[in-house]
């Protein structure tokens, strides 16, 4: 099919374009080019007769067109009016018509744009600025760049007028930047020169430096004032309300106590018409003052609060030192010093952080120490402890229980017996107790500052007869050669002797057996399977004695290396093979078999009827104890011979 390709499609004014003809038929009489989407004699550009090789200009011929023998049309020195469609009418030698239409677009070479602004000196937070990209050009795309970056997304930035105008609403000092606009069309792109937006702002509240307000007599006072402002601020100084000078810096040499007072810096912006002031109070000491410590929190709560200790006063060109417990500061991630060492911050205080703390100011000859400061860290109450620890008493004795819980401020205590409040004291005393005094004894500790409470409950039994003891264990299923077991004889009773028996015998002497806690606790180190015995404890006093029920220690062990039976390894063909595997283990192991490495069955016994030489090979028994996490195995070679070939062969089971 006859087609026209425009090279290029987008053409710059003054350049040239080639209307390239594809699939031109053979055996042509001639062809004719027309401007427009259809054949129209009045808009014929040029015609070409193949036979005469004669090109004839038409009414639309401009003198800039060249027709080629392949029917392609070159148009030079392109003008805007050339934009549009072009139709080629081809007449074949058999006088058959064929036609095709192509098109191109003409764009001007863009001039270098420039930016015009409606406000050369906008005021911050007040004015808007509209930048317009000049000149206005048809069929051009407008782009904007801020500091050579594309426009940020902001509700204060608005593009309008086909992106030709960029408006900044409510300008801020941060809008002070380099702005460029760019014009683009399909044939060219040009960027403007930068326009720097000059935003008038401030003055902000001035800052007086240095920040320290305490000076020694004889020093020089040199104060500097700065306020963010555009144009730069004009500064004035006032001392105790009296104007001093219109400078940014105030210098007073060799100051005395009389120079103490309020120092005011006033910043003025002549363009915005705004004034801002800042006041600092300067104290001049006749001699170096004794330092003192201030705290931002006089009653910090443990594990909750941080405390900032500040060494006062603030004095220029001074070195600050700190001591805790009369020692220099320890290295700790919870201790932080400010840059000037004047403030010591304790993060997440603990009860151990009470101090005392001292700070010091170093002068030429000595170090002036502050008085020590002790932190009042509020903590607790911790779980209260009831003493003594006995739980069994004989009738007629006095019951004296004491309760203590670590707490600051000290805890307030309450006693309850079987849930009934008794008294608000730290100690509970009951004389000449009877069986009726048995029960649940609760101590409640309360911290009035934190509002926290903690309780501990103790069971008290009053009985003439000792109770039947029982054995508690810290490990009900110890693993052989790995674990230790501690047996404790319960309960703990006053004036009581504790005894132990193993399998009905008194304790053997062994470095692995140890008695502690007044013989109340028996510890077996590195248990073995032989320790799986019956353990009994006994209690006795001058009135009675009693023994516990036996506790049998369940020691987990194994599996040991298994044994395959029968031991025979040679069999006759046709016999039954019946192998049994056994391994010492607690609990009993899981068994599995492999023949020549191939898994078989998970049973203790492997049975194969009527074996043949094909059953020759290695028979492996695998044992696994899930409780100890240990495994073991054994391998046995089995040989099966054809019947009657060799004497002394087993006939099997």
């Amino acid at each position: 099919k006859l087609t026209i390709e425009s090279t290029p499609f987008n053409v710059a004014e003054g350049k040239e374009v080639l209307l390239l003809v594809h699939n031109l038929p053979q055996h042509l009489f001639g062809y004719s080019w027309y401007k427009g989407e259809r054949v129209d004699g009045n808009r014929q550009i040029i015609g070409y007769v193949i036979g005469t090789q004669q090109a004839t200009p038409g009414p639309a011929y401009s003198g800039r067109e060249i027709i080629y023998p392949n029917a392609s049309l070159l148009i030079q020195n392109i003008i805007q009016n050339d934009t549009g469609f072009y139709t080629l009418h081809v007449i074949k030698s058999d006088l058959v018509n064929e036609e095709a239409t192509g098109q191109f677009r003409v764009y001007p070479e863009l001039p270098k744009p420039s930016i015009s602004s409606n406000n050369s000196k906008p005021v911050e937070d007040k004015d808007a600025v509209a930048f317009t990209c000049e000149p206005e050009t048809q069929d051009a795309t407008y782009l904007w760049w801020v500091n050579n970056q594309s426009l940020p997304v902001s509700p204060r930035l608005q593009l309008s007028n086909g992106n030709r105008t960029l408006t900044l609403f409510n300008v801020t000092r941060n809008d002070t930047a380099s702005y460029k606009c760019e014009t683009q069309n399909p044939v060219s792109a040009r960027r403007s020169d930068s326009v720097i937006l000059n935003v008038l702002y401030g003055p902000d509240a001035p800052t007086i430096s240095p920040l320290n307000t305490s000076y020694r007599s004889g020093e020089n006072l040199n104060l500097s004032c700065h306020a963010a402002s555009n144009p730069p601020a004009q500064y004035s100084w006032f001392v105790n309300g009296t104007f001093q000078q219109s400078t940014q810096e105030l210098f007073i040499p060799n100051i005395t106590v009389n120079n103490s007072g309020s120092y005011t810096c006033q910043a003025h912006n002549s363009d915005t018409g705004l004034n801002r002031t800042t006041v600092t109070t300067i104290t001049v000491y006749a001699e170096p003052p004794k330092p003192f410590i201030t705290s931002n929190n006089s009653n910090p709560v443990e594990d909750e609060d941080a405390v900032a200790l500040t060494c006062e006063p603030e004095i220029q060109n001074t070195t600050y030192l700190w001591w805790v417990n009369n020692q220099s500061l320890p290295v700790s991630p919870r201790l932080q010093l400010s840059n000037d060492n004047r403030t010591l911050t304790l993060l997440s205080v603990t009860r151990n952080d009470v101090g005392p703390y001292e700070c010091g100011i170093q002068n030429e000859l000595s170090v002036d120490h502050s008085d020590p400061v002790i932190l009042n860290v509020l903590y607790g109450p911790d779980d209260p402890t009831i003493s003594p620890s006995y739980t069994y008493y004989r009738p007629g004795v006095n019951l004296s229980l004491s309760c203590h819980a670590a707490s600051n401020p000290p805890a307030q205590y309450s006693w309850l017996i079987d849930g009934n409040i008794q008294q608000h004291t730290q100690e509970l005393f009951i004389s000449n107790i009877t069986e009726k005094n048995s029960g649940l004894y609760t101590c409640q500790a309360n911290n009035s500052a934190s509002g926290h409470s903690r309780t501990t409950v103790k069971t008290i039994t009053v009985s003439a007869e000792l109770p039947k003891p029982s054995i508690s264990s810290n490990n009900s299923k110890p693993v052989e050669d790995k674990d230790a077991v501690a047996f404790t004889c319960e309960p703990e009773a006053q004036n009581t002797t504790y005894l132990w028996w193993v399998n009905g015998q008194s304790l053997p002497v062994s470095p692995r057996l140890q008695l502690s806690n007044g013989n109340r606790t028996l510890t077996l180190f590195n248990v073995t399977r032989n320790d799986a015995r019956a353990y009994v404890c006994g209690i006795q006093n001058s009135v009675s004695a009693n023994r516990s029920d036996p506790v049998t220690l369940d020691v987990l062990y194994g599996p040991d290396t298994p044994i395959i039976s029968p031991p025979d390894s040679s069999y006759l063909s046709g016999a039954n093979l019946n192998l049994s595997c056994h391994s010492a283990s607690n609990p009993s192991p899981q068994y599995s078999w492999r023949i020549n490495g191939i898994p078989q069955q998970h049973t203790q016994v492997l049975f194969i009827a009527k074996i043949t030489p094909n059953n020759n090979g290695t028979y492996a028994c695998f044992v696994s104890n899930l409780a100890t996490g240990r495994n073991n195995s054994i391998v046995k070679s089995i040989t099966v011979s054809a019947s009657g070939t060799s004497p002394g062969l087993s006939a099997g089971a």
């Epitope: 009045n42 014929q44 007769v49 004839t56 038409g58 009418h89 058999d94 018509n97």
Partner: antibody, heavy 121, light 108 residues
């Protein structure tokens, strides 16, 4: 307004000759091809001959080839048809028509009223 | 040469009715090169449609053309009294340029 006016009608004997003219106005004559179409009594339209606007390219129907000659005078905005060796079957109303194209394109956007040619003994 | 056959030869309809005229080519032609003309007795023929479907300047939109290849149609959606005439199709894709024999549209 485009106007095409044919002239040269007449009665002619078989074997005789006749020259038809078409005066054009209302458009740039030299920019367009021109054509002659005829309609025999009781028949349909039949294209006869065409000539391009700025280049001397001429087409003829087989029925008139060698006997008719088409020509134009762009300075006078006039189209001609010289008819020789006329036959009875040439009897028809002859219409002059303006082609859409500069070269012979074949699409006729304006026509004249026609002129009657009668060939009879 | 390409022969164009129009049907029907005569079409009798009343004003306000829809008229459909057919033109069949003896071989396939590009739709660019098919035109329709209206011819009234004693008047100059008038170009109605070119390119099979594009209306010529000043032609009312009740006239429409369609088709491709060998089959083309002229449709008059709602006949007006002035539409009764002879209609010709024409191909100008290859010389000789040929017309159909015409369809006479008459008032019923």
């Amino acid at each position: 307004e485009v106007q095409l006016v044919e002239s040269g009608a007449g009665l002619v004997q078989p074997g005789g000759s006749l020259r038809l003219s078409c005066a054009a106005s209302g458009f740039t004559f030299s920019s367009y091809a021109m054509t002659w179409v005829r309609q025999a009594p009781g028949k349909g339209l039949e294209w006869v001959s065409a000539i391009s606007g700025s280049v001397d390219i001429t087409y003829y129907a087989d029925s008139v080839k060698g006997r008719f000659t088409i020509s134009r005078d762009n300075s006078k905005n006039t189209l001609y048809l010289q008819m020789n060796s006329l036959r009875a079957e040439d009897t028809a109303v002859y219409y002059c028509a303006k082609d859409r194209g500069n070269w012979n394109y074949g699409l006729f956007d304006y026509w004249g009223q026609g002129t009657l040619v009668t060939v009879s003994s | 040469e390409i022969v164009l056959t129009q049907s029907p030869g005569t079409l009798s309809l009343s004003p306000g009715e829809r008229a459909t005229l057919s033109c069949r080519a003896s071989q396939s032609i590009s739709s660019i090169y098919l035109a329709w003309y209206q011819h009234k007795p004693g008047q100059a023929p008038m170009l109605l449609i070119y390119g099979a479907s594009s209306r010529a300047t000043g032609i009312p939109d009740r006239f429409s053309g369609s088709g491709s290849g060998t089959d083309f149609t002229l449709t008059i959606s709602r006949l007006e009294p002035e539409d009764f005439a002879v209609y010709y199709c024409q191909q100008f894709g290859s010389s000789p340029w040929t017309f159909g024999q015409g369809t006479k549209l008459e008032i019923k």
